[in-house]
């Protein structure tokens, strides 16, 4: 598998897709999990509804959500207000039985909010007519790794 | 009118099986999942299994207890969901309910039941 | 598995009188759940769903609240039609009901 960058930017939202054949993964439940480790187990952060039938709605574990559009065949993940120490890697799974298969690889990278680095001259404040509460930014920017690229840094 | 009339209900002895049919009328029956309830004597009422809508095709969920033994199917042709019960035990007493799920307006469902059937009678005793 | 504990099992109230119906889930279920009527001999009926949104003909006076772990149903001004036990159902989950309330008359 080929691992997916996603970049957030901190204290916003990420949105995660992971596409997959609906008729193969046909009535399997998904799963978001975080590696632990270049060769570690992958820990189950969320998973979708205890029934196949009711996968598109929405379930939370803290700040993550999954949903799953089984007939688009599109499993969706949003980390809501991210932090640094959401940055890692995570597989997108398709259950069955005890069994997990790899949907996706994606690593998750956390940028500093440029709002936090900038002179006060710089700011942009809404206008009368605009304001934060307003605006529901879900911030994704996504590549896949080039080769040679580590998901995860060498430990000295 | 959106109707659900369910039948088949009756006296059977532990172990045997017994098939409820919920005739539907009035509504598009592909569209909706449907789906199976019951409610012992005096008790209070308990999910049994669905059956998704024709874009599901016809897959089905069941509760832990009826897994394995009761088998939900649908004929589109007809407009009838059946509830298939094997092996029954003396707990299946219940009246069975059939039930439509709730679509709303953009197309998606919601697991509530918006019309249901009037309710058979199936009784588990040697 | 989440449980539903639904309270009071019973009550009695007058006509007119407001009466609340509690149901508590064992676990976070967001916004998922539904309430139900259910009077003697009757299928059940679906009055509120998503936890606040009134079910289509159903009257104004019933009305529900609350996510997470808990829950409200009200009829503002409880009519002789009215009795009936009430039953919540979450869907977060399974679908588990809670116990039922039955409403009666003083």
């Known amino acids: 598998h080929n691992t997916t960058v996603f970049q957030g930017v901190a204290g916003q939202s990420l949105q995660v897709s992971c596409p997959y054949d609906s008729m193969k993964h046909w009535g399997r439940r998904k799963a978001w999990c975080r590696q632990l480790g270049e060769k570690g187990p992958c820990q189950r952060v969320v998973s979708t509804h205890n029934l196949w039938l009711l996968s598109f709605l929405r379930r939370w574990n803290g700040s993550t959500a999954i949903t799953d559009d089984t007939l688009g065949g599109t499993l969706t993940i949003t980390l809501r207000n991210l932090q640094p120490h959401d940055a890692g890697l995570y597989q997108c799974q398709s259950l069955h039985g005890s069994e997990a298969d790899t949907l996706r690889k994606v690593l998750v990278e956390v940028l500093a909010d440029p709002l936090d680095h900038r002179d006060a001259g710089d700011l942009w404040f809404p206008g009368e007519s605009e304001s934060f509460e307003d605006a529901h930014v879900e911030h994704s920017i996504s590549r896949s790794l080039l080769e040679g690229e580590i998901p995860f840094p060498p430990t000295s | 009118e959106v109707q659900l009339v369910e039948s088949g209900g009756g006296l059977v002895q532990p172990g045997r099986s017994l098939r409820l049919s919920c005739t539907a009328s009035?509504?598009?029956?592909?569209?909706?999942?449907m789906s199976w309830f019951r409610q012992a004597p005096g008790k209070g009422l308990e999910w049994v299994g669905f059956i998704g809508s024709k874009a599901y095709a016809g897959t089905t969920e069941y509760t832990a207890s009826v897994k394995g033994r009761f088998t939900i199917s649908r004929d589109g042709s007809k407009s009838i969901a059946y509830l298939q019960m094997n092996s029954l035990k003396t707990e299946d007493t219940a009246v069975y309910y059939c039930a439509r799920g709730k679509r709303y307006s953009y197309g998606g469902w919601v697991p509530a039941f918006d019309v249901w059937g009037q309710g058979t009678m199936v009784t588990v005793s040697s | 598995d989440i449980q539903m504990t639904q309270s009071p099992s019973s009550l009695s109230a007058s006509v007119g009188d407001r009466v609340t119906i509690t149901c508590q889930a064992s676990q976070d279920i967001t916004n998922y759940l539904n309430w139900y009527q259910q009077k003697p001999g009757k299928a059940p009926k679906l009055l509120i769903y998503?936890?606040?949104n009134l079910e289509t003909g159903v009257p104004s006076r019933f009305s529900g609240s609350g996510s997470g772990t808990d829950f409200t149903f009200t009829i503002s001004s409880l009519q002789p039609e009215d009795i009936a036990t009430y039953y919540c159902?979450?869907?977060?989950?399974?679908?588990?009901f809670g116990g039922g309330t039955k409403v009666e008359i003083k």
């Open positions: 159902q979450e869907y977060d989950s399974y679908l588990a």
């Open positions: 998503d936890a606040s």
């Open positions: 009035g509504f598009t029956f592909g569209e909706y999942t």
